[in-house]
Interface confidence: low
C-alpha cells in the first residue's frame, strides 16, 4: 500500500516519499521509483534556509543605501543578508526594512540610553537639580552647578533646562 | 563647488580594456552612493553600475555584468569602472555620477542622481 | 526589470505656453513609506544630464517652481507651467525603487 505519511526530511508526491532538498538547494525533479530526488545549489544571490521542495531560491534581501541600509551580515546560499541602519540612523522595525534618524532628546530631557542601529533613543526627564538646555541624541542630564563649592550663592534657580546662576555674596554696601 | 570630472575615455579597439575614473570635490565622497551612467551617440541614457559609500555593495548591469567593475578609492575621491572585453555596442558617453541622500519628512531618503560629470566618450571600434 | 515608457517622445511647444509629459511604469514604484520612487532629468543640447525632481513630486535644488512633478503607483507626469526657451532639450524619467535603475526612452521638448 502507497503510504500516507513521510519520514522527517521526505515529502509525499505520486504516492511515493522523496528525499526533500537540503538548505541551499532547490528542487531540479521529484524522485522516482528509480531515480534520487535532484537538487540544485542556490546562486550566489539567492538562499534557501530550510530542508525544502521549492523549484526557487528566494533572493537576498538588498540592503538599500537609499534607505539608509547597510549589510550587517552577508547572506549565504543558508542564510539571508542581514540589513542594518547606518550610523545616527535605526530601524523602523524588526525586518529593518527602513531607518530612520536617532530621536533627540528635547531640552529638560536626557539620554537614558543611547540609540544603536536597532533600538531609537530613550529619553529621560532631568530630575531636581540636573538639567539639559540642548536637543542632542547622547548628552545626558547634567547636574546644576553648585555655588557653594565655588564660594557663591545661586543668584538664579536652576530648572530642568537650565543651570543656576551663581554670585558673589553680597557686599557691604559703602 | 560639488564637482565630479571624469576620464579615461579613448579609441579602443574591440576585446580590449579601458579604466575610466571619476574625480571628486567639494563634498564628502566617502558619504554618497555612486553610480556609473552612459549614454550611445543619438540614444537615451542607460544605467550602468552603482557601489555603494563604503564599496560594500556593488551592482552592474546585466549588459555589463562579468566584463565591467565598478570600484572606488574614497581615500583619493575617486571612483573607478574598469570595462574589459569591449564592445561596439559598449560605445557611449560614460557619467559619472551621485546619489544624492537627505532627511526627508523625518526619514533617512533617497532625493536624486543630483550630481552628474560632464562625461568620458568611449569609443569602441576596430 | 521595471519598463519606464514615455510619451510623446517628440514635444513641440511655443514659448510661454504648458507642457506636459507622461511616465508610465510597467510595475508599481510607491514604496511601503509612501514615497513614489520616481525622478524625472533634463539633458539640455550638449550638455550633462541633471535633476529636476526626485521622489515623484520634489523639486531638486535650484530647480525653477514651473516644473511640477505628480502621481502615484505606475502613472506619473512632469508639468512645466510656462516654457522657456532655456527649457528645450531631452527630458527622461527614471526608476530609483529597484537595481537595475532603468529610464524611459526620453522625450524631445523644441520649440515651436
Known amino acids: 500500500e502507497p503510504p500516507t505519511a513521510c519520514r522527517e526530511k521526505q515529502y509525499l508526491i505520486n504516492s511515493q516519499c522523496c528525499s526533500l532538498c537540503q538548505p541551499g538547494q532547490k528542487l531540479v525533479s521529484d524522485c522516482t521509483e528509480f531515480t534520487e530526488t535532484e537538487c540544485l545549489p542556490c546562486s550566489e544571490s539567492e538562499f534557501l534556509d530550510t530542508w525544502n521542495r521549492e523549484t526557487r531560491c528566494h533572493q537576498h534581501k538588498y540592503c538599500d543605501p537609499n534607505l539608509g541600509l547597510q549589510v550587517q551580515q552577508k547572506g549565504t546560499s543558508e542564510t539571508d543578508t542581514i540589513c542594518t541602519c547606518e550610523e545616527g540612523l535605526h530601524c523602523t522595525s524588526e525586518s529593518c526594512e527602513s531607518c530612520v534618524p536617532h530621536r533627540s532628546c528635547l531640552p529638560g530631557f536626557g539620554v537614558k540610553q543611547i540609540a544603536t542601529g536597532v533600538s531609537d533613543t530613550i529619553c529621560e526627564p532631568c530630575p531636581v537639580g540636573f538639567f539639559s538646555n540642548v536637543s542632542s541624541a547622547f548628552e545626558k542630564c547634567r547636574p546644576w552647578t553648585s555655588c557653594e563649592t565655588k564660594d557663591l550663592v545661586v543668584q538664579q534657580a536652576g530648572t530642568n533646562k537650565t543651570d543656576v546662576v551663581c554670585g558673589p555674596q553680597d557686599r557691604q554696601r559703602a | 563647488q560639488v564637482q565630479l570630472v571624469e576620464s579615461g575615455g579613448g579609441v579602443v579597439q574591440p576585446g580590449r580594456s579601458l579604466r575610466l575614473s571619476c574625480a571628486a570635490s567639494g563634498f564628502t565622497f566617502s558619504s554618497y552612493g555612486m553610480h556609473w551612467v552612459r549614454q550611445a551617440p543619438g540614444k537615451g541614457l542607460e544605467w550602468v553600475a552603482v557601489i555603494s559609500k563604503d564599496g560594500g555593495n556593488k551592482y552592474h548591469a546585466d549588459s555589463v555584468k562579468g566584463r565591467f567593475t565598478i570600484s572606488r578609492d574614497n581615500s583619493k575621491n575617486a571612483l573607478y569602472l574598469q570595462m574589459n572585453s569591449l564592445r561596439v555596442e559598449d560605445t557611449a558617453v560614460y557619467y559619472c555620477?551621485?546619489?544624492?541622500?537627505?532627511?526627508?519628512?523625518?526619514?533617512?531618503?533617497?532625493?536624486?542622481?543630483?550630481?552628474w560629470g560632464q562625461g568620458t566618450t568611449v569609443t569602441v571600434s576596430s | 526589470d521595471i519598463v519606464l515608457t514615455q510619451s510623446p517622445l517628440s514635444l513641440p511647444v511655443t514659448p510661454g505656453e504648458p507642457a506636459s509629459i507622461s511616465c508610465r511604469s510597467s510595475?508599481?514604484?510607491?514604496?511601503?513609506?509612501?514615497?513614489?520612487?520616481l525622478d524625472w532629468y533634463l539633458q539640455k543640447p550638449g550638455q550633462s544630464p541633471q535633476l529636476l525632481i526626485y521622489l515623484g513630486s520634489n523639486r531638486a535644488s535650484g530647480v525653477p517652481d514651473r516644473f511640477s512633478g505628480s502621481g502615484s503607483g505606475t502613472d506619473f507626469t512632469l508639468k512645466i507651467s510656462r516654457l522657456e526657451a532655456e527649457d528645450v532639450g531631452v527630458y527622461y524619467c527614471?526608476?530609483?525603487?529597484?537595481?537595475?535603475?532603468?529610464f524611459g526612452q526620453g522625450t524631445k521638448v523644441e520649440i515651436k
Open positions: 555620477v551621485r546619489r544624492g541622500h537627505q532627511l526627508v519628512l523625518g526619514y533617512y531618503y533617497y532625493n536624486g542622481l543630483d550630481v
Open positions: 510595475q508599481s514604484l510607491l514604496y511601503s513609506n509612501g514615497y513614489n520612487f
Open positions: 527614471m526608476q530609483a525603487l529597484q537595481t537595475p535603475r532603468t
